[in-house]
């Protein structure tokens, strides 16, 4: 009598996560009688996947009707495959007994699971940085298999080269994660810039996944300050203008000081955007020259995005103007927002 053979024709099978995997196994004889069992892995720690005779295995169904006469096909179908199902599966013939005795194993079929990477998540620096500084962006994607993966960084469509990428774990695993860091040198024009992390994987069929971050979250463009005096008005009032230009973000507080004393404080709000994404703001102060004996030192103090205040001062020459008794030092708040 010929010795029983357990035939697993495929050395390996690759399946997309969520699909069903078919693991083929046939035996060469009905004799000796006894169950076929499927295991993942070999040795004492192997995991029982299916036993036709005993137990319930809701995810596993036999491919052929095992109750059919002369059935020698013990192939199984495992539904809803996840990366955790990866491994080598063995079809094992047992001789009926109390307990059943292992007789022969198939050569094994390695099941690999193709799992899509998760959508890349890009995170930027915790604090804003100014132009000419370098900031780091990180991109993370998880749960993919096989391990081979490509990750690229782009800034405004141009590929970045200052990149460090790691795929973990280094050894064999059911699924993998990728983490990449890109270093970007900021320019004043980057308010509207965007970095893109692009992940390509065999499971994506040439349609890479992208994660984005806006540099507007990472950049601070400090303002330029300019204080100027308009020509004297007929009522002896001088209009002094503080022009705050090309700043980002909008969070800005402006304080006028007259001879070191706070005259007025304003907060920027609802400013129109420049083409490059920055903002401008103009504030003015009316100074009644006739109310002062001495020259008036006006200071425009700007606190931008929580940074130390920046000052710009201007002296109004009182000696050049005739004096009037009893007039107010400063006019009402007539500051306006200008582009």
């Amino acid at each position: 009598e010929e010795e029983l053979q357990v035939i697993q024709p495929e050395k390996s099978v690759s399946v997309a996560a969520g699909d069903s995997a078919t693991l083929n196994c046939t035996v060469s004889s009905l004799i000796p009688v006894g169950p076929i069992q499927w295991f993942r892995g070999a040795g004492p720690g192997r995991e029982l996947i299916y036993n036709l005779k005993e137990g319930h295995f809701p995810r596993v169904t036999p491919v052929s009707d095992p109750t059919k006469r002369n059935n020698m096909d013990f192939s199984i179908r495992i539904s809803n495959i996840t990366p955790a199902d990866a491994g080598t599966y063995y079809c094992v013939k047992f001789r009926k007994g109390s307990p059943d005795v292992e007789l022969k194993s198939g050569a094994g079929t390695e099941l690999s699971v193709r799992a899509k990477p998760s959508a890349p998540v890009v995170s930027g620096p915790a604090v804003r940085a100014t132009a000419e500084h370098t900031v780091s962006f990180t991109c993370e994607s998880h749960g993919f298999s096989p391990r081979d993966i490509t990750l690229k960084w782009f800034k405004n469509g141009n590929e970045l080269s200052d990149v460090q990428t790691n795929v973990d774990p280094a050894g064999k695993s059911v699924s993998y994660s990728i983490r990449s860091t890109a270093r970007v040198v900021l320019t004043r024009r980057d308010v509207h810039s965007q970095v893109i992390c692009e992940v390509a994987h065999v499971t994506l069929q040439g349609d890479p996944l992208r994660g984005t971050a806006n540099l507007s979250e990472a950049i601070r463009v400090p303002p330029f300050l300019e204080v100027t005096q308009q020509s004297m008005r007929a009522d002896n009032q001088v209009n002094v203008t503080c022009q705050v230009t090309k700043f980002y973000p909008q969070r800005l507080q402006l304080t006028w000081l007259e001879n070191g004393n706070v005259s007025r404080t304003e907060m920027a709000s609802a400013l129109p955007e420049n083409k490059d994404g920055t903002y401008n703001w103009t504030s003015w102060l009316l100074v009644n020259v006739s109310a002062h004996r001495d020259d008036v030192k006006l200071t425009c103090q700007v606190e931008h995005d929580g940074q130390p205040a920046v000052n710009k001062s201007f002296s109004v020459k009182v000696s050049a103007h005739p004096k009037e008794q009893g007039s107010n030092t400063a006019a009402e708040n007539t500051g306006t927002n200008e582009r």
Partner: antibody, heavy 121, light 111 residues
């Protein structure tokens, strides 16, 4: 340990009805075909009925002598198989065995101890 | 239906000798190279116990002194050497087709 325990036998009059029960333990009942076989001095061992698995749509088969009178059924949740016997005849007298079919081929590897049915007026 | 005829109806064999029981089917019980014949032993007050499956294969836990052979329509159960505990009635049964049928039995007595 595989165990099959029959119950429900007794003395019945011809034309009467009776239901035999068999409770199984020690194995995954729902994965096995189950059978009833009876034995009498006159007829020897006689296969009566078979019920297959849920995956076989609980297909049933009967000996010609009981067809239309006997009904085999199973309740996998209770690991039980039943034999409903109607219109009983004297020749239905015997020991009724509940049997597990190991390999879907009338491979009768485990038998219960049997329950006795006597049909007599 | 396939009729199974067993012979002899009874036999007496000396301890240590060979007992041979025959079972003839009215129609072949062989398909696809397999012989769908089974042998059982029954002692008084007990249910039958499976000895041999598919004509020639020893059921788990059955002593090796029991053996089966045959194909098609003619099958044989051999017991050698016979022991005292082998005194029983032996039945053949087929599963070649529905309905499954049993032979009439052979009563073995040990001398």
């Amino acid at each position: 340990e595989v165990k099959l325990e029959e119950s429900g036998g007794g003395l019945m009059q011809p034309g009467g009805s009776m239901k035999l029960s068999c409770v199984a333990s020690g194995f995954t009942f729902s994965n096995y075909w189950m059978n009833w076989v009876r034995q009498s001095p006159e007829k020897g061992l006689e296969w009566v009925a078979e019920i297959r698995l849920k995956s076989n749509n609980y297909a049933t088969h009967y000996a010609e002598s009981v067809k239309g009178r006997f009904t085999i059924s199973r309740d996998d949740s209770k690991s039980s198989v039943y034999l409903q016997m109607n219109n009983l005849r004297a020749e239905d007298t015997g020991i009724y065995y509940c049997i597990r079919d190991y390999d879907y081929d009338a491979y009768f590897d485990y038998w219960g101890q049997g329950t006795t049915l006597t049909v007599s007026s | 239906d396939i009729v199974l005829t067993q012979s002899p109806a009874s036999l007496a064999v000396s301890l240590g000798q060979r007992a041979t029981i025959s079972c003839r089917a009215s129609k072949s019980v062989s398909t696809s190279g397999y012989n769908y014949m089974y042998w059982y032993q029954q002692k008084p007050g007990q249910p039958p116990k499976l000895l041999i499956y598919l004509a020639s294969n020893l059921e788990s836990g059955v002593p090796a002194r029991f053996s089966g052979s045959g194909s098609g329509t003619d099958f044989t159960l051999n017991i050698h050497p016979v022991e005292e505990e082998d005194a029983a009635t032996y039945y053949c049964q087929h599963s070649g087709e529905l309905p499954y049928t049993f032979g009439g039995g052979t009563k073995l007595e040990i001398k």
